[in-house]
Amino acid sequence: AGYVFRDKVMSEFNNNFRQQMENYPKNNHTASILDRMQADFKCCGAANYTDWEKIPSMSKNRVPDSCCINVTVGCGINFNEKAIHKEGCVEKIGGWLRKNV
């Protein structure tokens, strides 16, 4: 039962994270939550950084600055892969949840 519950939590978290991405950066509250998660967990996107390509409000050559290894204003514009966290947040935060929840 515990594994089923954990998988359900992960699935919900994945869906919720992707929903929040769709609202980025239009919704300031959403943006700050996502930015905090990406910066704190050193991750980018849901599955990986390429998820940001699919967000209509984001230019295809851009990720949020919170994806950058060294966060500075505008660092996510025309990003280089070596300058950003490439791993996805769902797996990274999911791993943390599995250990701590």
Partner: antibody
């Protein structure tokens, strides 16, 4: 020193195919996005395609979409452009170009290879 | 897509002259603007990046300015080797990466 050497250009008939190669040396290839940029005779510069460090991200100009495919082999420090269904307006010098990204500009260009599409 | 418009498209000047070329973007590109020089039969060469930063090895007579939508490339005192074609290019929003149409600088 940084070197980008293109090869594979030549004369091809309309509808034909060609594969351009670019051999990179003198720098860490995986640190850079790479581009193909072309210049038709007597005309300006036109971006054709780019590929990210790992090859996970690839984009083409609308004018070549569905016909040209960019790829890279990081083990061989090589960049490629597969060109299919070639048309007369694809005639140009094709440059292999290094891209540090951010706001740094295209800092190194190859000497170019001429592709001529004519019957 | 962001359009880049250069002016003038051609320009005649003499050695020693001060020359300014302008580039306008169809929307704000902050400072994500680069300038290139190209001589006949040669590959382009990066002169200025980030609107105003001089690329390593480029003479200090070249300078760039502007931000947002309006940019300039200035050559303070033209030298014989500066007669060439100059292009601006934006990297703020892509694809596509877009260039200006070029400015041909000729000897008067």
């Amino acid at each position: 020193q940084v070197q980008l050497v293109e090869s594979g250009g030549g004369l091809v008939k309309p509808g034909g195919s060609l594969r351009l190669s670019c051999a990179a040396s003198g720098f860490t290839f995986t640190d850079y996005f790479m581009n193909w940029i072309r210049q038709a005779p007597g005309k300006g510069l036109e971006w054709v395609s780019y590929i990210s460090n790992s090859g996970a991200i690839k984009y083409q100009a609308d004018s070549v979409k569905g016909r040209f495919t960019i790829s890279r082999d990081n083990a061989k420090n090589s960049l490629y452009l597969q060109m299919n269904s070639l048309r007369a307006d694809d005639t140009a010098v094709y440059y292999c170009v290094r891209d540090p990204r951010s706001y740094y500009g295209f800092d190194y260009w190859g000497q170019g290879t001429l592709v001529t599409v004519s019957s | 897509d962001i359009q880049m418009t250069q002016s003038p498209s051609s320009l005649s000047a003499s050695v020693g002259d001060r020359v300014t070329i302008t580039c306008r973007a169809s929307q704000s590109i902050r400072n994500f603007l680069n300038w290139y020089q190209q001589k006949p039969g040669k590959a382009p060469r990066l002169l200025i990046y980030a609107a105003s930063s001089l690329q390593s090895g480029v003479p200090s007579r070249f300078s760039g300015g502007g931000s947002g939508t309006d940019f300039t490339l200035t050559i303070s005192s033209l030298q014989p080797e500066d007669f060439a074609t100059y292009y601006c290019q934006q990297s703020y929003s892509n694809p596509p990466i877009t260039f200006g149409q070029g400015t041909r600088l000729e000897i008067k």
